[in-house]
Interface confidence: low
């Protein structure tokens, strides 16, 4: 006779693990028991569990609860064992030992391979700005035996490293994704990928990227200077910019304090029915968090009575 | 072995907005899970939410798009924020660490904190 068995069983972590050990025998030969042992330990082969054919299925301590037999119905040839709830430890060379009458024991090895998933973790990394050069955007780990691929899926283009660190029953790989930050990759999403054999579909973790930055200032509203004379109303700036966090405006004027009636909507400054009063310097200051910008034009309001012109200059600084 | 405290809980009319943290200290591991269950009186306990460490989130669907799940790594605590809070949502709240173990994984639960909502 001989024994049929498995070179390797494959498991996730968790599942039940059946180790197969069936006895093709001659006709008449009988199978008296079957005893299973870890075949990689230290000292010496440790029994998991012995199947006996009178006195039925004992199972060593250090198993007990885990090694079960196959349900309903049973050939009593077969001396295949269900591990409970396979864990990393599981994982090894076991061995089969039959015992037959009249032709005396049989031996055969497997190999467990038990799969432990990930569970990856994606980290931004530190907080991306607009004229930053190569930087972290964000790092992706995951540990699983054995060692699962880490991979990115993304529109933005950047580069990619990665390490991996052998543990002792698993590995940890991190790839980083490096980039140089732009205000187009704001909202842009940034996927981590994560793929092993012991999953059904890769992982995915989405970071969307924030890249703080602040566009120019620029102030509209005096593109048509003959609009500016005494008495017209509905007169107003607008402060045009644009940046992440989004900006506040603040307006004031340069040459003294706003006028009265004057009002400050957001970007907008809003005039009341015009006089040469309102002539001035007018400073829009557009901030957030990442920086500071400032426009500044010179409004010079038309008085018809008056035969003189009316000039307008615009001046950015940032 | 983790301990797990839950806070925030108490009553709020229909309607209204929540926020449930839970911290865990002790043995906590680099790739734990965490969330909150709910069980009503006379109920099953039922999933709510669970995060990854990395925030990955996953909810059951009668509560998408109402309740937010966060967590802060640093802290080891998780968060439910519940708004457009309903009747229904009235139960015990308790939060979970998912740890691994000898055995595969083991859930580590909190004692858990009343939510009533009223109508």
């Known amino acids: 006779g001989e024994l049929e068995t498995s070179d390797v069983v494959t498991v996730v972590l968790g599942q039940d693990a059946k180790l197969p050990c069936f006895y093709r025998g001659d006709s008449g030969e009988q199978v008296g028991q079957v005893a299973w042992a870890r075949a990689d330990a230290g000292e010496g082969a440790q029994e998991l569990a012995l199947l006996h054919s009178k006195y039925g299925l004992h199972v060593s301590p250090a198993y007990e609860g885990r090694v079960e037999q196959p349900p309903p119905p049973r050939n009593p040839l077969d001396g295949s064992v269900l591990l409970r709830n396979a864990v990393q430890a599981d994982e090894g060379e076991y061995e089969c030992r039959v015992s037959t009458f009249p032709a005396g024991s049989f031996q055969a090895r497997l190999r467990l391979r038990v799969l432990v998933p990930p569970l990856p973790s994606l980290n931004p990394g530190p907080a991306l700005e607009e004229g930053q050069g190569l930087t972290l955007a964000a790092s992706c780990t995951a540990e699983g035996s054995p060692a699962p691929s880490v991979t990115w899926d993304t529109e933005v283009k950047g580069t990619t490293s990665s390490r991996s660190f052998k543990h002792s029953r698993s590995a940890a790989v991190t790839s980083e994704f490096h980039l140089v930050p732009s205000r187009s990759m704001n909202g842009q999403p940034l996927t981590c990928v994560v793929s092993h054999p012991g999953l059904l579909q890769d992982q995915r973790i989405t970071h969307i990227l924030h890249v703080s930055f602040l566009a120019e200032a620029s102030v509209r509203g005096l593109e048509d200077q003959n609009l500016w004379h005494v008495g017209r109303e509905g007169a107003m700036l607008k402060c045009l910019s644009e940046g992440q966090p989004p900006p506040s405006y603040n307006w004031t004027r340069l040459d003294g304090p706003l006028p009265s009636g004057v009002r400050v909507d957001g970007d907008t400054l809003g005039f009341p029915p015009l006089t040469t009063e309102h002539s001035g310097i007018y400073v829009c200051h557009v901030s957030n968090e990442f920086s500071s910008r400032d426009s500044q034009v010179t409004v010079d309001v038309l008085d018809p009575q008056e035969d003189s012109g009316k000039q307008v200059d615009l001046v950015s600084a940032s | 072995e983790v301990q797990l405290v839950e806070s925030g809980g108490g009553l709020v009319q229909a309607g209204g907005s929540l926020r449930l943290s839970c911290a865990a200290s002790?043995?906590?591991?680099?790739?734990?899970?965490m969330g909150w269950h709910r069980q009503a009186p006379g109920k099953q306990r039922e999933l709510v939410a669970t995060?990854?460490?990395?925030?990955?989130?996953n909810y059951a669907d009668s509560v998408k798009g109402r309740f937010t799940i966060s967590r802060d790594n640093g802290k080891n605590t998780v968060y439910l924020q519940m708004n457009s809070l309903k009747p229904e949502d009235t139960a015990a709240y308790y939060c979970?660490?998912?740890?691994?173990?000898?055995?595969?994984?083991?859930?580590?639960w909190g004692q858990g904190t009343q939510v009533t909502v009223s109508s």
């Open positions: 979970v660490d998912v740890e691994p173990s000898g055995m595969g994984w083991r859930d580590y």
């Open positions: 002790g043995s906590i591991s680099s790739i734990n899970l």
């Open positions: 995060i990854t460490r990395g925030g990955s989130t």
